[in-house]
Interface confidence: low
């Protein structure tokens, strides 16, 4: 570490005095201090002498000696006061620029340490500091305004009491700049716009920044629009607003509009699309198939997408039958708005009951008229089966009726012994009926089919079983001949309750 002679931290001299500061190090050394006149510098290898024969108040300041070759970067310093009764302040800079929330050093150096007790900071023309100005003073460095705010951008003077009167420094202008985090913030409203030809429209492009120096413009397709700009300042931000008012829109006004703002940090842009239409429109669509099949007891959500302009004046879900005059519960109907002109409407149908099969229609209305979208909901049922013994054209016949949706397939089994259900080991014969007779097949209802098995002689120690199945499930009915006469026996687990 270099050594300064005289080896004192502070040196106080009178104007006109001779001052010699010597710095000695292991290698070459350099002086650094406030820019001031009358100093001469002599260097010889490892020492350097800074001297003046006529010290003035402007020589007041801290002089630092460094050794450039020292890897530890050590330095030594001495502070020189040139005590001038007429000049209590040496101002090193008349303009100080900092960013908001930084500390701002106003470099007015006191030329006489004795005056320290009577110093103060004021704004020019004797105006007091703004409220909440937090500052400190160092006789070596000057006044520091802590965490400077933009509003503290003012002209300041340093004041010292000398013989009962205040003596001011020359003024120092403080410029506190807003920290500009990036390009201006932008809003372009609306995000999307539809108007009917001849209607009025408004597009507003606004940009804001903490700093006033930014530009904003609105362009249509690639043409920059000449629009008067409104400027404002609130919430500590500068705002510039461009408002495009169109009294009667036409097709040439349609297209892409971009709001662009730029500052030293860069450029931001955002776009919207303006559509001009000939007349009001209302379009209903669904991503779902309009013909729906759901197993009884399960749930279904019916969804309709609506594109409309102007906005809807009314909408509802209606059940069109055929089973009852019930209407969908309003709490099961839900509306969500994707954006201004597109909406999704959902009807939730939980745990569907047989009476809820049928047509569901979504109706919507706007000035363009009414539109409707209708879903057809068919419920799927596992088959229900029953078997009876009868005579047809004199022949003993087992008659199996199976009801379900989709249409059930029918298989007959004959097996040994009396059983609720034939298993593989007992099966004596199997007959598939590829074309059972369809007894009823109405929309939204179960399909009922009938299959006949002609039996010349009923074997009394055997079971005849009719099995029906479809994509939902299966059902069966075991017919057990009893010597006293035909007897049917449906196993409990095939009883079906919707």
């Amino acid at each position: 570490i270099p050594v300064i002679e005289p080896s004192v931290p502070e040196l106080v001299v009178k104007p006109g005095a001779t001052v010699t500061l010597r710095c000695v190090g292991n290698g070459s050394v350099e002086w650094d201090g406030p820019p001031s006149p009358h100093w001469t510098l002599y260097s010889d290898g490892s020492s350097s002498i800074l001297s003046t024969n006529n010290a003035t108040f402007q020589n007041t300041g801290t002089y630092r000696c460094t050794e450039p070759g020292d890897p530890l970067g050590g330095s030594a310093a001495i502070h020189l006061y040139v005590k001038d009764p007429a000049r209590p302040w040496n101002v090193l800079a008349q303009e100080v620029v900092v960013f908001e929330d930084q500390d701002a050093l106003l470099p007015c150096l006191l030329t006489d340490p004795v005056l320290e007790a009577g110093v103060s900071l004021v704004r020019v023309r004797g105006r007091p500091l703004m409220r909440h100005t937090n500052y400190s003073f160092s006789p070596w460095h000057g006044f520091t305004i802590h965490r400077a705010k933009f509003i503290q951008s003012q002209d300041y003077q340093c004041s010292a009491l000398m013989g009962g009167r205040k003596v001011m420094s020359i003024s120092i202008r403080l410029k506190v700049q807003k920290v500009i985090p990036g390009p201006p913030a932008l809003t372009l409203v609306p995000a999307e716009l539809v108007r009917i030809r001849g209607e009025a429209a408004q597009i507003v492009c606004s940009a804001s920044s903490v700093d006033v120096n930014f530009d904003v413009f609105l362009q249509h397709n690639n043409t920059k629009l000449a629009i008067p700009q409104q400027s404002d300042f609130h919430n500590n931000r500068y705002q510039k607003v461009l408002t495009l008012n169109l009294d009667q829109v036409d097709f040439q006004h349609a297209g892409n509009y971009s709001c662009v703002a730029s500052n030293v940090q860069g450029k931001h842009s955002t776009s919207m699309f303006f559509r001009v239409v000939e007349s009001a429109y209302l379009n209903l669509s669904s991503e779902q198939n309009l013909i729906q099949e759901v197993t009884v007891g399960e749930g279904l959500n019916l969804k309709v997408m609506v594109e409309a302009y102007p906005g809807l004046q009314g909408f509802n879900w209606t059940y069109l039958g055929p089973f009852s005059d019930h209407q969908p519960e309003p709490k099961l109907a839900n509306a969500t708005t994707k954006d201004t002109y597109r909406h999704t409407f959902t009807l939730s149908l939980p745990r569907l009951k047989p009476s809820e099969a049928g047509r569901y229609s979504f109706l919507a209305r706007n000035p363009g008229g009414w539109r409707a979208l209708t879903f057809e909901l068919t419920l799927r049922y596992p088959p229900e089966v029953s078997v009876i013994w009868t005579f047809i054209n004199g022949s003993g016949t087992l008659l199996c009726a199976a009801s379900g949706y989709p249409q059930p397939n029918v298989t007959w089994l004959q097996c040994s012994g009396h059983t609720d259900r034939c298993d593989e080991a007992q099966v004596l014969q199997v007959w598939d009926d590829p074309y059972p007779e369809v007894l009823s097949q109405e929309p939204f209802h179960k399909v009922t089919v009938q299959s006949l098995l002609t039996v010349e002689t009923l074997e009394h120690n055997q079971t005849y079983e009719c099995r029906a199945h479809n994509s939902v499930g299966s059902g069966s009915w075991a017919f057990i001949p009893i010597s006293a006469g035909a007897h049917t026996h449906p196993p409990d687990e095939f009883l079906f309750t919707p």
Partner: antibody, heavy 122, light 107 residues
Framework: EVQLQQSGPELVKPGASMKISCKAS????????VNWVKQSHGENLDWIGL????????SYNHNFRGKATLTVDKSSSTAYMELLSLTSDDSAVYYC???????????????WGQGTSVTVSS | DIQMTQSSSYLSVSLGGTVTINCKAS??????LAWYQQQPGNAPRLLIS???SLETGVPSRFSGGGSGKDYSLIITSLQTEDVATYYC?????????FGGGTKLEIK
């Protein structure tokens, strides 16, 4: 501040027609609907109809079709209701109201004019 | 048209008390219901929209409830300035229709 300023009270003869005005201020006139409501005997409220200022579209209560005609003047942000072939049954206070702009807010009437008293008498 | 029925034309309640005003629609109105307050000599004022949403500036002692066809307006801690006629209005189906009103008086 949103305001709807209606024209003053009217005394008209049976069979005559008259026009009530409603000047809107403090909001974008074309972004909302204007509704008209009749209040008879200081009690029952009846919705007459609405007009959409941005395109002049109207929707009437069928009970007032042929009785009321709704119009707007966008340049002065003013809505008008003309009442035709007046009878004593038309004596009432008539209010203009601001209605919601689209279906998401529905058409609740969030601001009301001070009302215009109409007396039909010979 | 959807008819709106307010079961009570008049209600008399003590200061600080709680009152429930009922409104029944002749058909489902899917919560598209508004409540208005009309103080003597004034125009109606919107209190509640969407059956339950309190408008800005309306005291929290007012609340709305209900669904389907049946709705209610509840006023707690009744104040003298609550003396008024209260109307319900459906805006589900054109023509919009109002209830006959319920006049609230202080006992």
């Amino acid at each position: 501040e949103v305001q709807l300023q209606q024209s003053g009270p009217e005394l008209v003869k049976p069979g005559a027609s008259m026009k009530i005005s409603c000047k809107a201020s403090g909001y974008s006139f074309t972004d909302y609907t204007v509704n008209w409501v009749k209040q008879s005997h200081g009690e029952n409220l009846d919705w007459i109809g609405l007009i959409i200022p941005y395109n002049g579209g109207t929707s009437y209560n069928h009970n007032f079709r042929g009785k009321a005609t709704l119009t707007v003047d966008k340049s002065s942000s003013t809505a008008y209701m003309e009442l035709l072939s007046l009878t004593s049954d038309d004596s009432a206070v008539y209010y203009c109201t601001r209605g919601g702009g689209d279906f998401t807010t529905g058409y609740t009437m969030d601001y009301w004019g001070q009302g215009t008293s109409v007396t039909v008498s010979s | 048209d959807i008819q709106m029925t307010q079961s009570s034309s008049y209600l008399s309640v003590s200061l600080g008390g709680t009152v429930t005003i009922n409104c029944k629609a002749s058909d489902h109105i899917h919560n598209w219901l508004a409540w208005y307050q009309q103080q003597p000599g004034n125009a109606p004022r919107l209190l509640i929209s969407g059956a339950t949403s309190l408008e800005t500036g309306v005291p929290s002692r007012f609340s709305g409830g209900g669904s389907g066809k049946d709705y209610s307006l509840i006023i707690t801690s009744l104040q003298t300035e609550d003396v008024a006629t209260y109307y319900c209005q459906q805006y589900w189906s054109i023509p919009w229709t109002f209830g006959g009103g319920t006049k609230l008086e202080i006992k």
